[in-house]
């Protein structure tokens, strides 16, 4: 069944980063629109994205409602224009998204070094803690505040004059390492859950030095 | 020919409820999508909520969300808002209007409802 | 949301001269795969709903009269009303119906000067 001259969605991708979560589908219509419709297992379907000619469409507002729930989508197919000018044959196409859980599932951000500070021998580097736009109380959780300790950064960091990298690792944001007095160091960090099974690490965050702007050095 | 005919206004003190229906005549009613649009007493058109013509898919104006539903049955050709905790805002003539040659489009209107929200 | 101005917000015109109303989308209502700009006309007369007259920003509805017309694209829009009589004396209303919530322009009233 399905309406006359309409053809079901297909392909359709969770793309999510930090909660920022967006359906995407083919094909690109053609005398026809969509309708998405999302829901989690015990709840109504709610439709977004109302008779749309887009092939994507953001469902942060509704994933970050609970983030530790499990959604489902639907995109439905109706023809370009009423059902009477065009043909009609009972219920519209619909084709079903694959299951999204946004705690488990979310891509992890690029992570950024906020600041790194050299007192004597050790470093204390900081990681930006990024807002995403799962509220709580009106107000935007930071990554931090919504994974808690499920959330660990792995540290890299090596003498500017070598390539061997070391590593560390933390729970929180902020790291305290020990260096060698007189040696410049360069810093990367990634974002990591090891208790996932998918999408476990960020990709690595921009290299910061020591001797450039982030840098603060005291003896 | 089409026909749409809002019933259901009336005076009504805020945070309670209200049944608008529109009774359809004259057309397939199953084969269009409808719209509800409302006017405030001297003011222009806001659109307030859609339904697809099977009634899978409904949407809402943030300043309604939550609040109204719309609604429809084809075996009645009659379109329905339900509208709960009303404000003064709220106050308007509620008209229901047809899609026509497009989604959106409506190429045909009733002749409105008033809803007056007052203590 | 998209949000549309009118302009002028009144009108008076003498009858059997041209009437220009305009109308601004904050973005663009144009849809590129079939060129077509999802931008709709009403005129709405005293104690009555109102009534479609363009669609598509310039395809008349039919039983319209042809001193009726639309023009424009992508964000900017014009109702022309090429001879005003005396039963065109209205509040003319724009929408969009590009993406949703729809969306009115505020009206602009058009008297007999």
């Known amino acids: 069944s399905g309406t006359t001259n309409t053809v079901a969605a297909y392909n359709l991708t969770w793309k999510s980063t930090n909660f920022k979560t967006i359906l995407e589908w083919e094909p690109k219509p053609v005398n026809q629109v969509y309708t998405v419709q999302i829901s989690t297992k015990s709840g109504d379907w709610k439709s977004k994205c109302f008779y749309t000619t887009d092939t994507e469409c953001d469902l942060t507002d509704e994933i970050v409602k609970d983030v530790k729930q499990t959604y489902l989508a639907r995109v439905f197919s109706y023809p370009a224009g009423n059902v009477e000018s065009t043909g009609s044959a009972g219920e519209p196409l619909y084709e079903n998204s694959p299951e999204f859980t946004p705690y488990l599932e979310t891509n992890l951000g690029q992570p950024t070094i906020q600041s790194f500070e050299q007192v004597g021998t050790k470093v204390n580097v900081t990681v930006e803690d990024e807002r995403t736009l799962v509220r709580k109380n009106g107000t935007f959780l930071t990554l931090r505040q919504v994974f808690g300790k499920d959330l660990i950064y792995t540290l890299y960091y090596w003498k500017s004059s070598s390539s061997g990298k070391k590593t560390a690792k933390t729970n929180t944001n902020e790291f305290l390492i020990d260096v060698d007095k007189g040696e410049n160091y360069c810093f990367s960090v990634q974002a990591v859950i090891p208790s996932r099974t998918v999408n476990r690490k960020s990709t690595d965050s921009p290299v910061e030095c020591m001797g450039q702007e982030k840098g603060e050095f005291r003896e | 020919q089409v026909q749409l005919v809002e019933s259901g206004g009336g005076v009504v003190q805020p945070g309670r409820s209200l049944r608008l229906s529109c009774a359809a005549s004259g057309f397939t009613f199953r084969s269009y999508g409808m719209h509800w649009v409302r006017q405030a007493p001297g003011k222009g058109l806001e659109w307030v909520a859609v339904i697809t013509y099977d009634g899978i898919n409904k949407y809402y104006a943030d300043s309604v969300e939550g609040r109204f539903t719309i609604s429809r049955d084809n075996s009645k050709n009659t379109l329905y808002l339900q509208m709960n905790s009303l404000r003064a805002e709220d106050t308007a003539v509620y008209y229901c209007?047809?899609?026509?040659?497009?989604?959106?489009?409506?190429?045909?209107w009733g002749q409105g409802t008033l809803v007056t929200v007052s203590s | 949301d998209i949000v549309m101005t009118q302009s002028p917000d009144s009108l008076a015109v003498s009858l059997g001269e041209r009437a220009t109303i305009n109308c601004k989308s904050s973005?663009?209502?144009?849809?590129?795969?079939?060129?077509?700009?999802?931008l709709a006309w009403y005129q709405q007369k005293p104690g009555q709903p109102p009534k479609l007259l363009i669609y598509w920003a310039s395809t008349r509805e039919s039983g319209v009269p042809d001193r009726f017309s639309g023009s424009g694209s992508g964000t900017d829009f014009t109702l022309t009303i090429s001879s005003l009589q005396a039963e065109d004396v209205a509040v003319y209303y724009c929408q969009q119906f590009h993406s949703y919530p729809l969306t009115f322009g505020g009206g602009t009233k058009v008297e007999i000067k």
């Open positions: 209007a047809r899609d026509g040659v497009y989604y959106g489009v409506y190429d045909y």
């Open positions: 973005q663009s209502v144009l849809f590129s795969s079939n060129n077509k700009n999802y």
